[in-house]
Interface confidence: low
């Protein structure tokens, strides 16, 4: 088992909104849960966009999930990752 590296980034979206993206990379096996949470609770499926779980050329995998949130509410949001029985929670950078 190779645990993922998780990286959270933010980018400007429309006025008053930002897009936050959570990337998991270099993990094996390919089964992973990656989701955005607000106040600790997973966001609705249709408010998130997921990338495919793709091989990254080193025998491991990568994927991402993104959502759009209101600027100023960043600290209510976290990216939750679960892989091979281990889990972690990742905040939006300020």
């Amino acid at each position: 088992t190779v645990p993922p590296m998780v990286n959270v980034t933010r980018s400007e979206a429309s006025e008053g909104n930002i897009t936050v993206t959570c990337r998991a990379s270099s993990f094996y096996p390919r089964n992973i849960i990656l989701t955005w949470r607000q106040d600790g609770v997973s966001l609705a499926h249709d408010t998130q966009q997921w990338g495919d779980v793709l091989p990254d050329g080193n025998g491991t995998y990568q994927t991402w999930v993104a959502t759009r949130i209101c600027r100023g509410e960043e600290q209510r949001f976290t990216c939750y990752m679960e892989h091979s029985g281990n889990h972690s929670t990742h905040p939006v950078p300020s």
Epitope: R37, L43, Q75, Y80, E82, H87, T89, P91
Partner: antibody, heavy 122, light 112 residues
Framework: QGQMQQSGAELVKPGASVKLSCKTS????????ISWLKQKPGQSLEWIAW????????SYNQKFTAKAQLTVDTSSSTAYMQFSSLTTEDSAIYYC???????????????WGQGTLVTVSA | DVLMTQTPLSLPVSLGDQASLSCRSS???????????LEWYLQKPGQSPKLLIY???NRFSGVPDRFSGSGSGTDFTLKISRVEAEDLGVYYC?????????FGGGTKVEIK
């Protein structure tokens, strides 16, 4: 599951403030949401607020926004709640509790501290 | 705020009986993500509450299978199939779908 150890009972005067602590062990503190709850003798429970230990982000029950302030100290894995401008109505047991969001489950108050009794009296 | 109403206030039982506790919310408590965050807690005298059921019907780890939760929308039920002495205490329902999260007033299960 870990442990949550709360500070001892407090006897305080009206108008004063009190800072309660909830020291945790046995789990990754910064991954967790900690809530504080109030229970007056013989009554039900009220949720006050939560704090996400990873960022210090908070969400309050509007009823308590002017009364409670939540903070964390990640170096000691301890959550704090400062309660201000105390009145006799604030006499209660205060609990800290840890949320459990492992996997696809979602349980709010999965693990509890033993509670701290606060008595407000002149 | 979502008002959680529990009935009955007190439920006298004989050991071995089935007990049924009711909880009604003042509005639908389906979260925006589609889950219903309805939980049941048991508080024994002088102790902290303990989580029994989460998301309506899921038993928390270590909770005996004599406890079962059901319901949807605004009406929820906790059943204890065969009441044991250790089950006596006050049961609270709780909704975590709408802020502020709120508890019911409690149902006290006691010996008849």
């Amino acid at each position: 599951q870990g442990q949550m150890q709360q500070s001892g009972a407090e006897l305080v005067k009206p108008g004063a403030s009190v800072k309660l602590s909830c020291k945790t062990s046995g789990f990754t503190f910064s991954d967790n949401y900690i809530s504080w709850l109030k229970q007056k003798p013989g009554q039900s429970l009220e949720w006050i607020a939560w704090i996400y230990a990873g960022t210090g982000g908070t969400s309050y029950n509007q009823k308590f926004t002017a009364k409670a302030q939540l903070t964390v100290d990640t170096s000691s894995s301890t959550a704090y709640m400062q309660f201000s401008s105390l009145t006799t109505e604030d006499s209660a047991i205060y609990y800290c509790a840890r949320h459990d969001y492992y996997g696809t489950s979602g349980a709010w108050f999965a693990y509890w501290g033993q509670g701290t009794l606060v008595t407000v009296s002149a | 705020d979502v008002l959680m109403t529990q009935t009955p206030l007190s439920l006298p039982v004989s050991l071995g009986d089935q007990a049924s506790l009711s909880c009604r919310s003042s509005q639908n408590i389906v979260h925006i993500n589609g889950n219903t965050y309805l939980e049941w807690y048991l508080q024994k005298p002088g102790q902290s509450p303990k989580l029994l059921i989460y998301k309506v019907s899921n038993r928390f780890s270590g909770v005996p299978d004599r406890f079962s939760g059901s319901g949807s929308g605004t009406d929820f039920t906790l059943k204890i199939s065969r009441v044991e002495a250790e089950d006596l205490g006050v049961y609270y329902c709780f909704q975590g779908s709408h802020v502020p999260w709120t508890f019911g007033g409690g149902t006290k299960v006691e010996i008849k």
